[in-house]
């Protein structure tokens, strides 16, 4: 693995990184020293290779010469050839590998299994939440807060093809325009993806399987975040994916069909099934505003009910409000009718552990969570691990080139479409595109599918699994019919106009640059996948709903400085880039700012000390507080007394001056504290701060 | 067997109240409505309000409100009628009656009657 | 208030003869009228109730019929023990009305 992991792949010079870094450096390459560059004024400058404190942090990177930690690793064969195998070796090498192939099968089983029991208990755990968001038809016109609550919900039940049934369900019922559903449903898309980023957080043992998994799960984040960027406001001013989708509506008939196959289902329901079986109906009644079913649990006791339609008679406000004038009377008290109900009659519990136990949703949610979390990170353990095993030497060359080579010229371009697909098909055979690119995940990591590759299986699955919505809409029953289809069609759109937004123009392919970015981020500060997941996902969803909540005004009034100061960055990094003299000095560069600001070190500082705090039996919260403040406001040679007795044998000294206690250590601090603030990065020809500046 | 045992005859001076209990026996009370009907001497019958025994919910009939009260103990199985304000044209056979409630199957059982007879 | 006519107000009839007592409401009842009969020095007893179903333990010569607004109670052959007052009932909304009563005599 290369020093700078987050440096990797920034330029395609991998030597030119510092221009102007005053003083000696004690680890320039010999090979280096002496070499001469101009700067932007013209005065030659020593080429400098950099030190971990002068890392650069960017989202936007070109691939470098030499060692690249994207180049796909060479899974070499360490075992003896076939050639040198006696028969009996022979013989229990084929057993061997019969052996592992079943392994293999029952793991990847297990992973299916446990990522729909994940579903399950991230709905028992928000689904009720989750329909009550729902239920605010108000903010939902809102197209902002319809696309949060899309993103929240999708979350929240780890499904979006549940919440595209709930927003059917409105739909039909008239509870929600086509026009309102939109933004929700390319909130679902955006929700659906954050599972392979979980899936990819389960990779975080080697740094650049990491790094590769982390951003082959997020190029499908980035794909869908960029996509809403672009079409959420082109849709809310022309409303193009209604008007196409009624176009499309009314140019053919549409009559029921058959409902996609469950292949998947059909293998992985007879196990999850004794798991846990729930009542998706209810998150639906929820949305559509049943107060009852709020009490109600998700969990499914009874699995084999008989319906009776009975006559009952019920009390109405007033004769007027009879069903029929022959049925209608009075007791003196109450008037009375009488109604068609239809009773529901349990013949046979279901067959899961938790139909017995009186255990609130929430508890059972939690216990699933943890359980299949656990199941989730031990079968991606044994996967990659066998994986790693089977895929060596030959093996591995074939597999590799089969899924990663292009068609010979002038056919190339061609590969990236027969990928989607490829992923689409796919998708349509699993049923779900959670599913797929969950499995294509750990393939990422250990480098048998590249992020160019993957980048369209995952667009692929995106249509895959709208085809699916599509069919199981033509199998809708006839009320639902329309309105399903017609979400089901925005939905296929909406991805194919992300896909020609992303895809055919390499330069437009922004996604794999940005998940590698993140990736390289991800890779030397591993808490930052799961600040990104969480501010991502949850944070910023949540922010902009409690606004919406609070209105139109109050919405724009916070949104509008945040995203002008946002673009105002990037013109600013545009300018740093490209034309820096027209800058004045001061703005050529982040130094101006507070190094938190503009670095993840001293919140890396800030983390590593909070968690070797946690883990300590007793945590010195002064000295600790203390370090805080040094690294926060950029001093680096402070001194923090000890305030107490600690208890660790490394620390006896009775002062010590504040070291970084990140993941790497930083032999360049030292450094820093003499010539902080001198440090430049150049990166695409940007100039940007060091020390992994996220400008 | 259902019965409805109304209290005795009672002879009230104007101005003053009569309360007439009605005990039942012999059917769950509380799925029952109990209805108060009088007759006055040579008259028809004449509804004066029901009670849910249930739930205590009452209604009456627009020209006894206010002047009536129906309750109900449901330890006893017992129903009361208390009639205020009393005037001569109040004299009459007051009935409590029963109804199954949510049923449409009217006053299927009525009490003997208890006489009131309102004179100075 | 619903207001319920009853015809006649009496009548004298002979044992075995065939009774018809009417009753009309005011406005539209549906099939909510019942029919009570009340022996001299007795309390009411019900017969028919939903304008046409006999109370358990109802002699079936007394057949109720009608709907909406027009009903009558036939006593298809009258014994003696018939001798009473009956009144109709409609309970389509409160408050429960009755008609005024149809007296029954045997010559």
């Known amino acids: 693995m290369a020093p700078w992991p987050e440096l990797e792949n920034a330029h395609p010079n991998p030597n030119k990184f510092i221009e102007g870094a005053s003083g000696p450096q004690s680890s320039i390459p010999d090979k280096d020293k002496g070499t001469s560059k101009t700067n932007d004024s013209g005065t030659p400058v020593a080429k400098i290779e950099l030190l971990p404190s002068y890392s650069a942090l960017v989202l936007i990177e070109e691939p470098p010469e030499g060692n690249d930690p994207w180049d796909l690793p060479e899974l070499q064969d360490n075992g003896i050839k076939w050639s040198e195998r006696d028969s009996k070796g022979k013989i229990l090498c084929i057993f061997q590998g019969i052996g592992k192939f079943i392994l293999l099968l029952g793991f990847l089983y297990l992973f299916v299994c446990s990522l729909d029991v994940l579903s399950s208990a991230f709905q028992l755990v928000g689904g009720k939440m989750a329909g009550q968001f729902f239920s605010n038809n108000s903010i939902m016109s809102n197209p902002v807060a319809g696309l949060v609550i899309g993103v929240l919900v999708t979350v929240m039940v780890q499904s979006s093809s549940t919440s595209s049934s709930i927003i059917v369900s409105m739909v039909a019922s008239s509870l929600l325009s086509v026009r309102a559903a939109i933004p929700i449903i390319m909130g679902a898309n955006i929700g659906t993806s954050i599972t392979n980023t979980i899936v990819a957080l389960m990779q975080a043992g080697d740094r650049n399987e990491f790094r590769r998994a982390f951003a082959g799960a997020t190029v499908h984040d980035f794909f869908n975040w960029l996509s809403v960027l672009v079409l959420l406001p082109l849709e809310a001013a022309t409303h193009y994916l209604e008007k196409l989708t009624n176009l499309v509506l009314e140019t053919f008939s549409f009559q029921n069909g058959e409902d996609a196959p469950d292949i998947l289902k059909v293998i992985t329901d007879p196990f999850t099934k004794l798991i846990i079986q729930l009542d998706k109906k209810v998150i639906q009644q929820i949305a559509m505003g049943d107060s009852e079913a709020q009490n109600k649990s998700l969990i499914k006791i009874w699995c084999k009910t008989i319906s009776n339609v009975i006559e009952e008679n019920v009390t109405v406000p007033s004769p007027d409000n009879c069903t029929s004038p022959s049925y209608c009377w009075t007791d003196g008290i109450q008037t009375w009718t009488i109604q068609n109900v239809t009773e529901k009659e349990n013949i046979a519990k279901c067959q899961h552990i938790f139909v017995n136990f009186s255990l609130p949703d929430l508890a059972v949610g939690i216990i699933l969570l943890t359980v299949s979390l656990l199941i989730l990170c031990g079968c991606l353990i044994m996967i990659v691990k066998l994986l790693g095993s089977v895929l060596r030497g030959q093996v591995a060359t074939v597999i590799k080139k089969t899924l990663n080579t292009d068609f010979p010229f002038p056919f190339a371009w061609l590969t990236g479409y027969l990928a989607i697909l490829v992923g689409a098909g796919m998708t349509f055979i699993v049923q779900s595109s959670s599913v797929f690119t969950s499995a294509m995940t750990p393939l990422i990591g250990i480098g048998v599918i590249s992020i160019e590759r993957a980048y369209p299986l995952t667009l692929g699955s995106n249509i895959g699994t709208t085809t699916t919505a599509i069919l199981a809409a033509l199998a809708s029953p006839g009320n639902t019919l329309r309105s399903s289809l017609q979400i089901a069609l925005c939905h296929f759109f909406f991805n194919i106009s992300g896909i020609l937004l992303w895809y055919p123009i390499p330069f437009t392919r922004l996604p794999i640059r940005l998940a590698k970015g993140l990736g390289n981020i991800s890779a030397k500060y591993r808490w930052f996948a799961v600040f990104y997941l969480i501010f991502f996902f949850l944070l910023t969803p949540l922010t902009v709903f409690g606004l919406s909540l609070a209105g139109w005004p109050v919405l724009v009034g916070v949104g509008v400085p945040i995203i002008l100061l946002i673009l105002l960055v990037l013109c600013l990094r545009m300018l740093q880039a490209r034309c820096p003299r027209i800058l004045p000095l001061k703005l050529r560069d982040w130094n101006f700012l507070p190094l938190w600001m503009h670095s993840l070190k001293p919140w890396d500082n800030i983390i590593s000390l909070a968690t070797s705090c946690f883990q300590r039996r007793c945590c010195c919260c002064c000295r600790v507080c203390c370090r805080v403040c040094c690294m926060v406001c950029g001093c680096k040679c402070c001194r923090c007394s000890k305030c107490c007795k600690n208890l660790e044998e490394e620390e006896k000294e009775q002062d010590v001056p504040v070291k970084a206690s990140g993941g790497f250590d930083n032999t360049a601090m030292s450094k820093e504290c003499q010539d902080e603030g001198k440090g430049q990065v150049e990166v695409l020809g940007m100039k940007a701060l060091s020390n992994t500046t996220v400008f | 067997q259902v019965q409805l045992v109304q209290s005795g005859a009672e002879v009230k001076k104007p101005g003053s109240s009569v309360k007439v209990s009605c005990k039942t026996s012999?059917?769950?009370?509380?799925?029952?409505?109990i209805h108060w009907v009088r007759q006055a001497p040579g008259q028809g019958l004449e509804w004066i309000g029901g009670?849910?025994?249930?739930?205590?919910?009452?209604n009456y009939k627009q020209n006894f409100r206010g002047r009536v009260t129906l309750t109900a103990d449901k330890s006893t199985s017992t129903a009361y009628m208390e009639l205020s304000s009393l005037r001569s044209e109040d004299t009459a056979v007051y009935y409590c009656?029963?109804?199954?409630?949510?049923?449409?199957?009217?006053?299927?059982?009525w009490g003997q009657g208890t006489t009131v007879t309102v004179s100075s | 208030d619903i207001q319920v006519t009853q015809s006649p107000s009496s009548l004298s009839t002979s044992v075995g003869d065939r009774v018809t007592i009417t009753c009309t409401a005011s406005?539209?009842?549906?099939?909510?009228v019942a029919w009570y009969q009340q022996k001299p020095g007795k309390s009411p007893k019900l017969l028919i109730y939903?304008?046409?179903t006999r109370h358990t333990g109802v002699p079936e010569r007394f057949t109720g019929s009608g709907s909406g607004t027009d009903f009558t109670l036939t006593i298809s052959s009258v014994q003696p023990e018939d001798v009473a007052t009956y009144f109709c009932?409609?309970?389509?909304?409160?408050?429960?009305?009755f008609g005024v009563g149809t007296k029954v005599e045997i010559k």
């Open positions: 009656a029963r109804w199954r409630n949510a049923y449409y199957s009217a006053m299927d059982s």
């Open positions: 012999g059917f769950f009370f509380t799925e029952y409505i």
């Open positions: 009670i849910i025994p249930n739930n205590d919910v009452t």
């Open positions: 406005q539209d009842v549906g099939t909510a």
């Open positions: 939903w304008a046409s």
């Open positions: 009932q409609q309970y389509r909304t409160s408050p429960l009305t």
